[in-house]
Interface confidence: medium
Amino acid sequence: VPPGEDSKDVAAPHRQPLTSSERIDKQIRYILDGISALRKETCNKSNMCESSKEALAENNLNLPKMAEKDGCFQSGFNEETCLVKIITGLLEFEVYLEYLQNRFESSEEQARAVQMSTKVLIQFLQKKAKNLDAITTPDPTTNASLLTKLQAQNQWLQDMTTHLILRSFKEFLQSSLRALRQM
């Protein structure tokens, strides 16, 4: 990268993204790395990380989750169905990643990097998918009202929401990573 061309640290224009399976694999690991930093700050700030899974399950968040029918698990694996699920799930996570943007103090930059890296990952995966018609994009109006609702919660709920988003996103990406390695 020539001196002075490192603005905002988005990849320099000459670097064409490599869209091989390895590239996608590395992109996911990069995002997971960012998530672990955000989780570190969240866990240091609140005791959410110690809360039992059962207690945290009692929430009204509709976070994307892998199910048997999605074809991403070893039993009943279906490449096309699974890829559609991964892309759809990532698109659904975008509103939650937007919510995370104002939730961090020392890791503000990391939150941004996770959000931007996820957008890039979606692009990589869309190039890989053959059946783009099956991918449903979330409704912007619904997303906007969901964002407003999340931001209006009290401090404790916002802390819990942040923790849940990070945990669910991490689990979703880990499942996606395992599935993509079979493709």
């Epitope: 990268v1 001196p3 490192d6 640290d9 988005v10 990849a11 320099a12 670097r15 993204p17 490599l18 091989s20 399976s21 390895e22 590239r23 590395k26 992109q27 990069y30 790395d33 960012g34 672990s36 930093a37 955000l38 570190k40 890791s107 930059e109 990391q110 990097a113 931007m116 890296s117 890039v120």
Partner: antibody, heavy 123, light 104 residues
């Protein structure tokens, strides 16, 4: 302008310790994976250790595992290499390099290198 | 661990020649390979990343190819300033590793 400046090298006796530092500027340090590479006199390049951007996950060459520790301080834009139980075969120029950077993961190619700091292990 | 075997270890060529350096990986590394040039007394410089992508500012006479286990760096039309040692690096899986170098 991207700059990587290593310091902390010097002459040390076998079994001794040194801490190398690499001051980074001209880019958002916290977004980049960083790596130490070394080069023994008249020899080739040897990958020593890498550290992830955010989580601080690390990896080491077998030759330094258990003796060297890579770390970073994103607030200070600084990369470190703590070298303990030094051996004569650790004598080399140590380079700090930037890799796998920015929001788009492209490759681990090391696009910027510091000038290097000399470490000499001798009695 | 992945080993990289670089050949030849040294080579002599004339100005204008087409020069080929190869790097063989002990297992598949996809296209996760980069090439570096190190001139005497200087720090290494990235030439090629992702096996075949030319880094900005690197002359077009340099090119990289290959995937899996076999990779090639080609200099078409050797120039005096290309006198250097060339290294390949696999960054597919930790521990990363360099080839032993080719002195030109």
């Amino acid at each position: 302008q991207v700059q990587l400046v290593e310091s902390g090298g010097g002459l040390v006796q076998p079994g001794g310790s040194l801490r190398l530092s690499c001051a980074a500027s001209g880019f958002t340090f916290s977004n980049y994976y960083m790596t130490w590479v070394r080069q023994a006199p008249g020899k080739g390049l040897e990958w020593v250790s890498s550290i992830y951007s955010f989580s601080g996950d690390t990896a080491y060459a077998d030759s330094v595992k258990g003796r060297f520790t890579i770390s970073r301080d994103n607030a200070k834009n600084t990369l470190y290499l703590q070298m303990n139980s030094l051996k004569s075969e650790d004598t080399a120029v140590y380079y700090c390099t930037r890799n796998l950077g920015g929001v788009v993961v492209t490759t681990n190619g090391y696009d910027y290198w510091g000038q290097g700091t000399q470490v000499t292990v001798s009695s | 661990d992945i080993q990289l075997t670089q050949s030849p270890s040294s080579l002599s060529a004339s100005l204008g020649d087409r020069v080929t350096i190869t790097c063989q990986a002990s297992q598949s590394i996809s296209t996760e390979l980069s090439w570096y040039q190190q001139k005497p007394g200087q720090t290494p410089k990235l030439l090629i990343y992702g096996a075949s992508r030319l880094q900005t500012g690197v002359p077009a006479r340099f090119s990289g190819s290959g995937s899996g286990t076999s990779f090639t760096l080609t200099i078409s039309g050797l120039e005096a300033e290309d006198l250097a040692t060339y290294y390949c690096l696999q960054d597919y899986s930790w521990p990363y590793s360099f080839g032993s170098g080719t002195r030109l």
